[in-house]
Structures are given as structure tokens and as C-alpha cells.
Amino acid sequence: MAVTACQGLGFVVSLIGIAGIIAATCMDQWSTQDLYNNPVTAVFNYQGLWRSCVRESSGFTECRGYFTLLGLPAMLQAVRALMIVGIVLGAIGLLVSIFALKCIRIGSMEDSAKANMTLTSGIMFIVSGLCAIAGVSVFANMLVTNFWMSTANMYTGMGGMVQTVQTRYTFGAALFVGWVAGGLTLIGGVMMCIACRGLAPEETNYKAVSYHASGHSVAYKPGGFKASTGFGSNTKNKKIYDGGARTEDEVQSYPSKHDYV
């Protein structure tokens, strides 16, 4: 039950995270005009990964796409790439995790296959989240660098007479959306990986010994939760010595690579 809950919650958290990463990638407000300590402008400039916009005081908003590819800064291209990779990995992860959900039955899919798929999707979500966090952080670092550079020469004088006000940009809403979304996707991925451990059928290498007291047979089965869950299963008993001590091995034990995650 706990495994199903963990897996389901991981899926939902990752779904919200990936939706947030997509939203952040599409948003125009990655960087917004810094209004603090600046001349009060009748326009508000803001920029996204794909276009820059200007909102005039009348409310009229005009956006222009970056129609060049080669002319864009390498950092912006890198951020775009990271966000797209994050979205693609996240989307594939979602697709895989749907089939891996314990509550969904697809034919006679074994638990080991579901565990495999859960782990795969979990890793994809973790990488997706890291890509988004990295992309947003690279952009934020770029903004901070440019902010202090433009603060250093806020007014670039031309012959001491005419001044050009340099527009400074600060963090836009998309950065915060991206950070939160990336974090959620990461958390969701970790939850999927945790759920995978619970889903994986374990090979029981425990030897359970039965001690026969005089008159009745009382069995003691060491080995923790996993070994004791098969109390209704078929067991084969091997006689070791006449004193009545017997070893019990579970019949339904499959070796699994997830035993020691």
C-alpha cells in the first residue's frame, strides 16, 4: 500500500513539475526590467527564451520573436537546450511511469518489469529536474552578471552631454516557476526510485529454522518483513538432523537486480 502511494505521489509530483517546466520554458518573463532606482519609464520591458516584449503604459503589449539563431548568445542557446532536454526527458519519464504504476494493470506484466520501469522513469525525472534547475540557474547567473555590469555604467555619457539610460534586467517570474518546477520533478523522481525498491520482488537468501518442541511444532522465521510475508506460500522442508530442526526456503523467490538498490 505504502509503495503504491509513494509511486502514485511521485508520479503526480513529477507531472506537476514537468507541467511547470513546460510553462516556464514558454513564459516571456524570464528577465524583467528592473524598476528599482531607475528612471520611471512609461514602458515595461521583459524577455523570455523565445521573444522579448514591451508593455506600454496604455496596456498595449508588443512582442518580437528572436528570429535569428546564430546571432543569439551562446548562454541563451544553452538554456534553451537544457529546458528542452528537461521537457523531453520528463515527457518520456511520464509515459514510462504511467505503465509502471502499480494501480494500472497491463496484461500479465511482472512486478520486476514494473520496478524496472519505475526506476527508469525516476531517473528520467531526476535528470529532467536537474536540467531545468541548471537551465534556470545559468540564466539567473547571466542576469546577475549583466545587472552589475550595467550598474557599473548605468549612464553611458556621450561627450558629457547626452545620456543613454541602460535598461537593467532582474529575475522574472519564469525563473521562480522553473526552480520550483525543477525541484518538484526532482523530488518526484526520487520518490519513484524509492517506490521501485518496494516494488522489486526480493530473492530471499534467508534460512529460516524451525525448532520442534516436544508435543507441538512452533516455527520461528527470522528475516524481517520481506521473508515473513510469504506465510501462506508453499514451502519445501529439508530434513537436516533427527533433532527436528528444518530449513525452509521460499519456493517463489526470483533473483532481482533491485535487491540492493
Epitope: 520591458n45 522579448s52 506600454e56 503604459s57 496604455s58 508588443e62 518580437r64 545620456q163
Partner: antibody, heavy 120, light 113 residues
């Protein structure tokens, strides 16, 4: 047809107060920012204040801040300019003007103006 | 505040001749975000309110005759009346539309020679 009609001007003593009104018609008033601009007799134009469609933000020319207050009532399609502690140099024709949409913040329609005379 | 300096203060031009008015701003009116200039030109005839002629430094307002044209970028702008008509006698103002307060130039009075 867009129409802006100012009213409330007149003769007022120095230190006195006056409230100007601007009645708007012919357009969706609640969707547009509005300006007040004044013009002293025989002089040039001087921008006074701006109020956005939703009453925030509001901007004033520095020298009039604290004495002049701009407000609007979208339900009544009306713009107001409350003027206090009036001085002789506030004597001017006061115009209300609409902040045009998609005209790079220019003032696309103006009223005929109302004359305010501050004199003892 | 942005200072808008217009020149000349007055201009006398023969009918059908070209009239040119200059406007200089103390700071660039070119917005980097959209590479547009935020400068407007107004015409004010005696006893009338101002009328918008040009916005964005070079775009004519609808209904304005094509003899009026605006040019320039950054800090230097020009209003040109290609062939002066009698009805063009007025005072012309430039205005900064990028920074608050939205300052006006001192005005240029255009008369018939």
C-alpha cells in the same frame, strides 16, 4: 466619436482649492489611462499627471506632487484633478487627454480645456 | 527629468515650401526592448487643444496628411512639412513618451512668409 469635456475651472484665490472634472464618452473609458496637461497663457504645454486605467500606477510631475491629486471613477466615465494650495503660477488652461493604445504612449485625444485663474 | 529642446523657436516659410523643425532630448528615447523611439509630435492651432500628428518618432496618426513626416532616432528628431499649406500655421510640440514626467519641447511657431 471620442469626446473629452473638462469642467470645474474658474477664478480662485491663492491658497485655495479647486476640483477639475473630465467627462469622457465615445470609448471604453475604463480601458484607457488618462493624462492631465496644462498650458499657461502664451506658454508651452506642461504635463501634469497620469492615471492608469485601474487607478494604479499614478504619476505626477515632481513640482506638483503633494498639492495635486488625480483620480477617476470608471463607473461614471469621469476623470478628476484635485488642486490644493493653489498659486499664481498654477494659472493655466487644463486639458485632459487620453493615453492612446498602440501609439507609443502618445496622447491621442484631447479635451477643449478649462481655464483656472489663481488671483487675489 | 528629460529636457526636450526644440529649434527654431519660430519659422517663417513660403506656401508650398518645406518646413523643418528639430527636437533634441537630453536622454535617448530609443527603448532597447523593442528598438522603438518614444517621441510624439503635436500641432496646436490658436484657441484649440493640441492634436497628435506623429507618434513613435515616425508613424503618422490616422487622418494626418502625408505632407507631415517624422524622422530621427535616439536623441535627435525632425518633423518635416514637405509642402506648407495655409492650414499648417500653428505651434508644433515634440514630447518625450518614454520617461515620466512626459516632458514637452518649448514649441516651434510656424508662420507663412
Amino acid at each position: 466619436e471620442v469626446q473629452l469635456v473638462e469642467s470645474g475651472g474658474g477664478l480662485v484665490q491663492p491658497g485655495g482649492s479647486l476640483r477639475l472634472s473630465c467627462a469622457a464618452s465615445g470609448f471604453t473609458f475604463s480601458s484607457f489611462g488618462m493624462h492631465w496637461v496644462r498650458q499657461a497663457p502664451g506658454k508651452g504645454l506642461e504635463w501634469v499627471a497620469y492615471i492608469s486605467s485601474g487607478s494604479s500606477p499614478i504619476y505626477y510631475v515632481d513640482k506638483l506632487k503633494g498639492r495635486f491629486t488625480v483620480s477617476r471613477d470608471n463607473a461614471k466615465n469621469s476623470l478628476y484633478l484635485q488642486m490644493t494650495s493653489l498659486r499664481a503660477e498654477d494659472t493655466a488652461v487644463y486639458y485632459c487627454a487620453r493615453a492612446g493604445y498602440a501609439v507609443r504612449n502618445a496622447l491621442d485625444y484631447w479635451g477643449q480645456g478649462t481655464l483656472v485663474t489663481v488671483s487675489s | 527629468d528629460i529636457v526636450m529642446t526644440q529649434s527654431p523657436d519660430s519659422l517663417a516659410v513660403s506656401l508650398g515650401e518645406r518646413a523643418t523643425i528639430n527636437c533634441k532630448s537630453s536622454q535617448s528615447l530609443l527603448n532597447v526592448g523593442n528598438q522603438k523611439n518614444y517621441l510624439a509630435w503635436y500641432q496646436q492651432k490658436p484657441g484649440q487643444p493640441p492634436k497628435l500628428l506623429i507618434y513613435g518618432a515616425s508613424t503618422r496618426e490616422s487622418g494626418v496628411p502625408d505632407r507631415f513626416s517624422g524622422s530621427g532616432s535616439g536623441t535627435d528628431f525632425t518633423l518635416t512639412i514637405s509642402s506648407l499649406q495655409a492650414e499648417d500655421v500653428a505651434v508644433y510640440y515634440c514630447q518625450n513618451d518614454l520617461f515620466y514626467p512626459l516632458t514637452f519641447g518649448g514649441g516651434t511657431k510656424v508662420e507663412i512668409k
